[in-house]
Interface confidence: medium
C-alpha cells in the first residue's frame, strides 16, 4: 500500500528554490549555447517536473524521464566526451579550460541537475523539501538516482571516437564497477562508434610515482572494455595541478616534461 501521509525519508529534501534554479540554469545555458537556443525552458521544466511530481518517489523509472531527455537532446562531437568517476571537480576544471571537451554536466540536462536533489509525493502536486529517498537506506529507484542513470546511459550511448575517462587514483578501487561509470556508462559505449577508451588515472600524492595503470581494477576495466571490442589505453597523471596548468598554457617549457 502506498502511503498517503508525508513520507519521512532518510535523505536530504529537495534543494531550496529547485524550480527557480532549474529554470534559471536552463535559460542561461540555452542563451550561451547557440545550438540549444531553440529549447523552450518552460517546456523543459514542465517535462522535468512531470518525471517525478505526484509519483511515489521509490518507483521512478527511466521512462518517466524520456520526455525530458527528448527535449534535451544534444550531441557531442567525436573524440570530445570526457567521462569521470569519483573525481568530478577536476574533470569540470579540465573542461572549463579545454572548452571543446564535455562532461555530462557540461550538457544541458547534466548542467540543470548538477548538485541538486529533488523528489515529490505520491498523489500530490507538492515538491518534498523535507526529505527524499536515500539510495542505500531507502531505495535505488528514486528521482535523482534514476535521472543520473538515464542521462548517463544516454551520454555514453551517443559518444563516438576516442572517449576519455578521468579516474581517481587515490581511491582503493580506482575503477569501481558499482559507480555510475562502471555500472552504466562502460556498458553503454557503442563499439561501432567508439574506437577507444582512454583512462586518465589522477594521482593524489606529490611523491606518488607508481604506475597506477597496472592496478588490478584498471586491468579489470581493460578486460571489460576489450570484451566489448573497444581498444583501451591508460595514462598516469602524476601532477594534476601541472596537468591543468599545461592545458591552459601548452607552450610552457615545463609542459614538455611528464605530467
Amino acid at each position: 500500500v502506498l502511503p498517503r501521509w508525508r513520507q519521512q525519508w532518510s535523505g536530504s529534501g529537495t534543494t531550496s528554490r529547485f524550480p527557480e534554479t532549474v529554470l534559471a540554469r536552463c535559460v542561461k545555458y540555452t542563451e550561451v549555447h547557440p545550438e540549444m537556443r531553440h529549447v523552450d525552458c518552460q517546456s523543459v521544466w514542465d517535462a522535468f517536473k512531470g518525471a517525478f511530481i505526484s509519483k511515489y518517489p521509490c518507483n521512478i523509472t527511466e521512462e518517466d524521464y524520456q520526455p525530458l531527455v527528448k527535449l534535451g537532446t544534444q550531441t557531442v562531437p567525436c573524440n570530445k566526451t570526457l567521462l569521470w568517476s569519483r573525481i568530478k571537480d577536476l574533470a569540470h576544471q579540465f573542461t572549463q579550460v579545454q572548452r571543446d571537451m564535455f562532461t555530462l554536466e557540461d550538457m544541458l540536462l547534466g548542467y540543470l541537475a548538477d548538485d541538486l536533489t529533488w523528489c515529490g509525493e505520491f498523489n500530490t502536486f507538492e515538491i518534498n523539501y523535507q526529505s527524499c529517498p536515500d539510495w542505500r537506506k531507502d531505495c535505488s529507484n528514486n528521482p535523482v538516482s534514476v535521472f543520473w542513470k538515464t542521462v548517463s546511459r544516454r551520454f555514453a550511448e551517443t559518444a563516438c571516437g576516442v572517449v576519455h575517462v578521468m579516474l581517481n587514483g587515490s581511491r582503493s578501487k580506482i575503477f569501481d564497477k558499482n559507480s555510475t561509470f562502471g555500472s552504466v556508462e562502460v556498458h553503454n559505449l557503442q563499439p561501432e562508434k567508439v574506437q577507444a577508451l582512454e583512462a586518465w588515472v589522477i594521482h593524489g600524492g606529490r611523491e606518488d610515482s607508481r604506475d597506477l595503470c597496472q592496478d588490478p581494477t584498471i586491468k579489470e576495466l581493460e578486460s571489460i572494455i576489450s570484451k566489448r571490442n573497444i581498444r583501451f589505453f591508460c595514462k598516469n597523471i602524476y601532477r594534476p595541478d601541472k596537468f591543468l596548468q599545461c592545458v591552459k598554457n601548452p607552450e610552457d617549457s615545463s609542459c614538455l616534461s611528464g605530467i
Epitope: 528554490r17 527557480e20 529554470l23 542561461k28
Partner: antibody, heavy 121, light 108 residues
Framework: EVQLLESGGGFVQPGGSLRLSCAAS????????MNWVRQAPGKGLEWVSS?????????WYADSVKGRFTISRDNSRNTLYLQMNSLRAEDTAIYYC?????????????WGQGTTVTVSS | EIVLTQSPGTLSLSPGERATLNCRAS??????LAWYQQKPGQAPRLLIY???NRATGIPDRFSGSGSGTDFSLTISRLEPEDFAVYYC??????????FGGGTKVEIK
C-alpha cells in the same frame, strides 16, 4: 568604447517610486544578459535583478525586492531599466547596472559608474 | 542560497609585498567564481573569472586559484594602485548571485 551609464537616481520618501535607466553603448546590447547590483553606504555588493537576452523574456529578482522592483529592457534604445516601487529605507544604495560576460560563465565584466538612490522621510 | 565568506576582513601590507585573499563558499560552486576590485568612489572592476582566468587588461600580478568551496586571489607584488576592497562572487547556483563581504587591502 564599451560603456554603461546609469541615471534616474535621487531622493525619495518611503513608499515612493523611482525609475532607473542604464544606457549601453559600444557593444551589441541584445546579446547580453544585464543586471542591477546595489551597494548600501559602507556595505558590500548585493545582486538585485537580472534580465535575459533578446526580448528579456526571463527576469530574476533578489528576495528583498521581489514584487516591488521590475527590470526591463528596450533593445531599440539600448537601454536597461529598473522600476522601483514601494521603496524602503533599506533600499538606499548606489545602483550599478552591469553586463554579464557573453561566454560559458557569467561574471559581470562591464559596470556603469552607478546612480545613488536615497530613501528617507 | 550560497554564502561566501571572505578572509581576512582587512589586510595591512606594504607596496611590493604579496597579498593572499581567501573566499570560502558554503557549498560547491565548481569553478564559477569571480573576483572584483573596487576603489573608493568607483564601480567594481572584474579581475578574475572562472576562479583562475584573468579578465582582459588585468596585470599578471593578479592570479586566482581554487575550486569547489575554497578559493584565493593572490597579488604577487602590491602596487600603490592595488590598495582597494576586493569581492568574490559566485555564479554557479543562482538566483541569487551572491558576493562575499569583501577584503580591504590597506597600506601598512
Amino acid at each position: 568604447e564599451v560603456q554603461l551609464l546609469e541615471s534616474g537616481g535621487g531622493f525619495v520618501q518611503p513608499g515612493g517610486s523611482l525609475r532607473l535607466s542604464c544606457a549601453a553603448s559600444g557593444f551589441t546590447f541584445t546579446n547580453y544578459v544585464m543586471n542591477w547590483v546595489r551597494q548600501a553606504p559602507g556595505k558590500g555588493l548585493e545582486w538585485v535583478s537580472s534580465i535575459s537576452i533578446s526580448g528579456g523574456r526571463y527576469t530574476w529578482y533578489a528576495d528583498s525586492v521581489k514584487g516591488r522592483f521590475t527590470i526591463s529592457r528596450d533593445n531599440s534604445r539600448n537601454t536597461l531599466y529598473l522600476q522601483m516601487n514601494s521603496l524602503r529605507a533599506e533600499d538606499t544604495a548606489i545602483y550599478y547596472c552591469a553586463r554579464e560576460m557573453n561566454t560559458y560563465s557569467f561574471p559581470m565584466d562591464v559596470w556603469g559608474q552607478g546612480t545613488t538612490v536615497t530613501v528617507s522621510s | 542560497e550560497i554564502v561566501l565568506t571572505q578572509s581576512p576582513g582587512t589586510l595591512s601590507l606594504s607596496p611590493g609585498e604579496r597579498a593572499t585573499l581567501n573566499c570560502r563558499a558554503s557549498q560547491n560552486v565548481r569553478s564559477d567564481l569571480a573576483w572584483y576590485q573596487q576603489k573608493p568612489g568607483q564601480a567594481p572592476r572584474l579581475l578574475i573569472y572562472d576562479a583562475s582566468n584573468r579578465a582582459t587588461g588585468i596585470p599578471d600580478r593578479f592570479s586566482g586559484s581554487g575550486s569547489g568551496t575554497d578559493f584565493s586571489l593572490t597579488i604577487s607584488r602590491l602596487e600603490p594602485e592595488d590598495f582597494a576592497v576586493y569581492y568574490c562572487q559566485q555564479y554557479y547556483d543562482w538566483p541569487p548571485y551572491t558576493f562575499g563581504g569583501g577584503t580591504k587591502v590597506e597600506i601598512k
